[in-house]
């Protein structure tokens, strides 16, 4: 599930990783657009083992994965599976 969060927090990620995470280990991907006090776009991957990893948005693997998820959600549902949480 792709989630786009709009929160009132500042940046959530101190560091980022570009290391590939296989899809079978991912529970959900949280996208924090630039804004809401943070000067950067942030992508947070919640793993099935309950650990959380901040991923470099420029990492090719996460861009490819998000594109696949977007295409899949738009072809199976009338609206994309973006969950917007607005404070």
């Amino acid at each position: 599930v792709l989630e786009v969060y709009y929160t009132s927090l500042r940046c959530r990620c101190v560091q980022e990783s570009s290391v590939f995470i296989p899809r079978r280990f991912i529970d959900r991907i949280q996208i924090l657009p630039r804004g809401n006090g943070c000067p950067r776009k942030e992508i947070i991957v919640w793993k099935k083992n309950k650990s959380i990893v901040c991923v470099d948005p420029q990492a090719e693997w996460i861009q490819r994965m998000m594109e696949v998820l977007r295409k899949r959600s738009s072809s199976t549902l009338p609206v994309p599976v973006f969950k917007r949480k607005i404070p």
Epitope: R34, G35, P57, Q58
Partner: antibody, heavy 119, light 107 residues
Framework: QVQLVESGGGLVQPGRSLRLSCVGS????????MSWVRHAPGKGLEWVSA????????YYADSVKGRFTISRDNSKNTLYLQMNSLGAEDTAVYYC????????????WGRGTLVTVSS | DTQMTQSPSTLSASIGDRVTITCRAS??????LAWYQQKPGKAPKLLIY???SLASGAPSRFSGSGSGTDFTLTISSLQPDDFATYYC?????????FGGGTKLEIK
């Protein structure tokens, strides 16, 4: 290619107001974060303000907060900076910038417009 | 606010020299740092972002390194076109802040 053209600078008396404009072309204006950065004579660069593509998020340097307002009209591909209660310390070349995708880094710059605050 | 301190403020060097400029942050900013070049009467140009990523169109003789609080911009072999003022900028948090600049002069 990306082009940013500022206008509206000039000589203004202390306490008065001025509005700067910046017209962008060669990119999808409404999707881009935009900023104003200034360069005072003999000093370094100073970030002034930033605005999201939709205009829904704005940020300001402490030195201009409450006096300056950043806004945009995406139908005109134009960025604005409304400057009120101007003082001598606001004298500078003001640059309009387009940020890189996803980060607050000025990847593209206009040529700048000079604002001189003097009586 | 995160304060950015550059050193030296002025640097004299010759064509072909290897030049290093330092930027220090008042608090840890991971690798959220950019470098710009500005010539008199001209707009700045982006050289480096994310501490070490070369910006599009920037010559490969420019490189950046560092993480946390200490960062460097290196010019591997100084060219005539490189004499200018260089600024670092942090984008770890708002407000965005620039260093005071380093003026690179001909020796």
């Amino acid at each position: 290619q990306v082009q940013l053209v500022e206008s509206g600078g000039g000589l203004v008396q202390p306490g008065r107001s001025l509005r700067l404009s910046c017209v962008g072309s060669g990119f999808t204006f409404g999707n881009s974060w935009m900023s104003w950065v200034r360069h005072a004579p003999g000093k370094g660069l100073e970030w002034v303000s930033a605005i999201s593509g939709s205009g829904g998020s704005t940020y300001y340097a402490d030195s201009v907060k409450g006096r300056f307002t950043i806004s945009r009209d995406n139908s005109k591909n134009t960025l604005y900076l409304q400057m009120n209660s101007l003082g001598a310390e606001d004298t500078a070349v003001y640059y309009c910038t387009r940020d890189l995708p996803g980060i607050a880094v000025a990847g593209y710059w206009g040529r700048g417009t000079l604002v001189t605050v003097s009586s | 606010d995160t304060q950015m301190t550059q050193s030296p403020s002025t640097l004299s060097a010759s064509i072909g020299d290897r030049v290093t400029i330092t930027c220090r942050a008042s608090e840890g900013i991971y690798h959220w740092l950019a470098w710009y070049q500005q010539k008199p009467g001209k707009a700045p140009k982006l050289l480096i972002y994310k501490a070490s990523s070369l910006a599009s169109g920037a010559p490969s003789r420019f490189s950046g390194s560092g993480s946390g609080t200490d960062f460097t911009l290196t010019i591997s072999s100084l060219q005539p076109d490189d004499f200018a003022t260089y600024y670092c900028q942090q984008y770890s948090n708002y407000p965005l802040t620039f260093g005071g600049g380093t003026k690179l002069e001909i020796k």
